[in-house]
C-alpha cells in the first residue's frame, strides 16, 4: 500500500481541519486507513482519524480541535494497520480556508434596490470575524454568460444593488463565499445559492 | 502544570444522591478531547462510567450498567460533573476524572478511547 | 458490551525477570487497545497506547503488541518500581464503550 499524494490539510480556523490524499490503488479508506493526529503541547492525546473515501483512490479526514491559536502545530500519521505510510505535520493557522456564509438571503421590497444579505460564519469571539471580506457572484438562470461578481470589502455581510442593473422579468441567482486578508487564506466554499425574479421595471418616462 | 482536580465525595446515605466536580488546568485551549469518570471499589478493579466530549458537540458515551442512575454534565472544557443518583452501597469506590483521546469519522460521530491523564481520585462512600 | 479477559490475574517475578500480561477482546477492536499501571493508593498510569505505542515518558522496557482480539504487554526486565497492578483498556468500535481487564497484580517472588 502506497501513497500517492501525501496528505494536504486546510482549517476553517476553529473547530475542523481537513485533510485529503491519494492513494497508489482503489483503496477502502475507511477499512484499510487511519490518521493520528496530536497537537504539539504537553500533555496532549493522540487522536484517530478514520478516513472517507473522496473518489476512488482519494481519502478525506476530518481532524477536530477545540479551538486554533497562531502557534498550534499537529503531528500527523498515516498508517495502514500497523504500517505507517507517511508522517507530517500541520500548522492550521499558516493553510486557512473560512467557512462559507450561510443564511443568504435577497430582499426585492426595498424600491429599485436588491439587497443581499447573509451570515458571517464565524462568532464575533474567533479571529476570522473581523477579517472577512467578500465575494458575491450573481448570475441570470437563463443565460449563464450574464454573471458578475462583487467584492464586498467591508465589514457588513451585505450588498445592495439597483435593481436597473440587472434585467427585467428574469430569474437571477446569488451566492457568496468569503476569505480573510490577514491570515492569506483561500477562498471558502461558495455559500448554497438563493434565487429570486426580478420584477423591476424602468419608470414609464425612462422608457 | 498540568492536572486534573476532583471534589465532591464523602458520605451519603443509600437511596440518595451525590455531584462529583472535574476541574482540568494547565491544558491547551486547542485540544479537542473528552473527559471521562473511572471508579474503582476497594481493592477491586478499574471500572468505566462514561464520558463527555469537552468540545461544542458535547456528545456523551456512558458504560450500560451506568445509564439512567449517572449523569455526566459539563459547565465548561474545563469543568466537568458525574451526577449520581439512587446510590447503593456497591457505588462505594474512589472515583477518578480522567482525560481521553478519542476516535472520530467525519464530525459528528466521535467516540472516547484511552485516558491519557488522570486525577488523584475523590472518595465516596455509600452507607447508613 | 465488548468483554476483556485479562491473564494472568496475577504473578510473581524477580527483578530482571521478562513478564508478559495478555489481554483478549470478545470482538475485533482493531488497535484500540491501552495498557495502565496502577500502584496502591494511586491512581492509574498510561503505559502504552493503540496497542503498541508507548506513552510520554514511560521507559522503554515496556512494549505492547496485538491487534484485533489479541494483546500482549511485555516487561523485558523488571525492575523494582514495575511491582504493581497492570489493567488493559479496550475500546469498542461498534458501541463507544470503554472495558477494562481484570488486573494483574505483578508482585515479588
Known amino acids: 500500500m502506497k501513497v500517492l499524494q501525501e496528505p494536504t490539510c486546510v482549517s476553517d480556523y476553529m473547530s475542523i481541519s481537513t485533510c485529503e490524499w491519494k492513494m497508489g490503488g482503489p483503496t477502502n479508506c475507511s477499512a484499510e486507513l487511519r490518521l493520528l493526529y496530536q497537537l504539539v503541547f504537553q500533555s496532549s492525546e493522540t487522536h484517530t482519524c478514520v478516513p472517507e473515501n473522496n473518489g476512488g483512490v482519494g481519502c478525506v479526514c476530518h481532524l477536530l480541535m477545540d479551538d486554533v491559536v497562531s502557534m498550534d502545530n499537529y503531528t500527523l500519521d498515516l498508517w495502514a494497520g500497523q504500517q505507517l505510510l507517511w508522517k507530517g505535520s500541520f500548522k492550521p493557522s499558516e493553510h486557512v480556508k473560512p467557512r462559507a456564509p450561510g443564511n443568504l438571503t435577497v430582499h426585492t421590497n426595498v424600491s429599485d434596490t436588491v439587497l443581499l444579505t447573509w451570515s458571517n460564519p464565524y462568532p464575533p469571539d474567533n479571529y476570522l470575524y473581523n477579517d472577512l471580506t467578500y465575494a458575491v457572484n450573481i448570475w441570470n438562470e437563463n443565460d449563464l454568460a450574464d454573471s458578475r461578481i462583487h467584492n464586498v470589502t467591508y465589514l457588513k455581510p451585505t450588498l445592495r444593488i439597483p435593481a436597473s442593473t440587472l434585467k427585467s422579468g428574469i430569474s437571477y441567482r446569488a451566492r457568496v463565499r468569503a476569505w480573510a486578508q490577514h491570515y492569506n487564506t483561500t477562498w471558502s466554499e461558495w455559500s448554497p445559492s438563493t434565487k429570486w425574479y426580478n420584477s423591476y421595471r424602468e419608470p414609464f418616462e425612462q422608457r | 502544570e498540568v492536572q486534573l482536580v476532583e471534589s465532591g465525595g464523602g458520605r451519603v446515605q443509600p437511596g440518595g444522591s451525590l455531584r462529583l466536580s472535574c476541574a482540568a488546568s494547565?491544558?491547551?485551549?486547542?485540544?479537542?478531547?473528552?473527559m471521562c469518570w473511572v471508579r474503582q471499589a476497594p481493592g477491586k478493579g478499574l471500572e468505566w462510567i462514561g464520558c463527555?466530549?469537552?468540545?461544542?458537540?458535547?456528545?456523551t458515551y456512558y458504560a450500560s450498567w451506568a445509564k439512567g442512575r449517572f449523569t455526566i454534565s459539563k459547565a465548561s472544557s474545563t469543568t466537568v460533573y458525574l451526577q449520581m443518583n439512587s446510590l447503593r452501597a456497591e457505588d462505594t469506590a474512589t472515583y477518578y476524572c480522567?482525560?481521553?483521546?478519542?476516535?472520530?469519522?467525519?464530525?459528528?460521530?466521535?467516540?472516547?478511547?484511552?485516558?491519557?491523564?488522570w486525577g488523584q481520585g475523590t472518595q465516596v462512600t455509600v452507607s447508613s | 458490551d465488548i468483554q476483556m479477559t485479562q491473564s494472568p490475574s496475577s504473578l510473581s517475578a524477580s527483578v530482571g525477570d521478562r513478564v508478559t500480561i495478555t489481554c483478549q477482546a470478545s470482538?475485533?477492536?482493531?488497535?484500540?487497545l491501552a495498557w495502565y499501571q496502577q500502584k496502591p493508593g494511586k491512581a492509574p498510569k498510561l503505559l502504552i497506547y493503540?496497542?503498541?505505542t508507548l506513552a510520554y515518558g514511560v521507559p522503554s522496557r515496556f512494549s505492547g503488541s496485538g491487534s484485533g482480539t489479541d494483546f500482549t504487554l511485555t516487561i523485558s526486565s523488571l525492575q523494582p518500581e514495575d511491582f504493581a497492578t497492570y489493567y488493559c483498556?479496550?475500546?469498542?468500535?461498534?458501541?463507544?464503550?470503554?472495558?477494562f481487564g481484570q488486573g494483574t497484580k505483578v508482585e515479588i517472588k
Open positions: 494547565g491544558f491547551s485551549s486547542s485540544s479537542a478531547h473528552y
Open positions: 470482538e475485533d477492536i482493531e488497535s484500540y
Open positions: 480522567a482525560r481521553a483521546a478519542f476516535v472520530n469519522r467525519g464530525v459528528s460521530w466521535i467516540w472516547p478511547y484511552y485516558f491519557s491523564l
Open positions: 483498556l479496550g475500546s469498542s468500535y461498534s458501541t463507544g464503550s470503554n472495558i
Open positions: 493503540r496497542a503498541s
Open positions: 463527555i466530549y469537552a468540545g461544542s458537540r458535547g456528545s
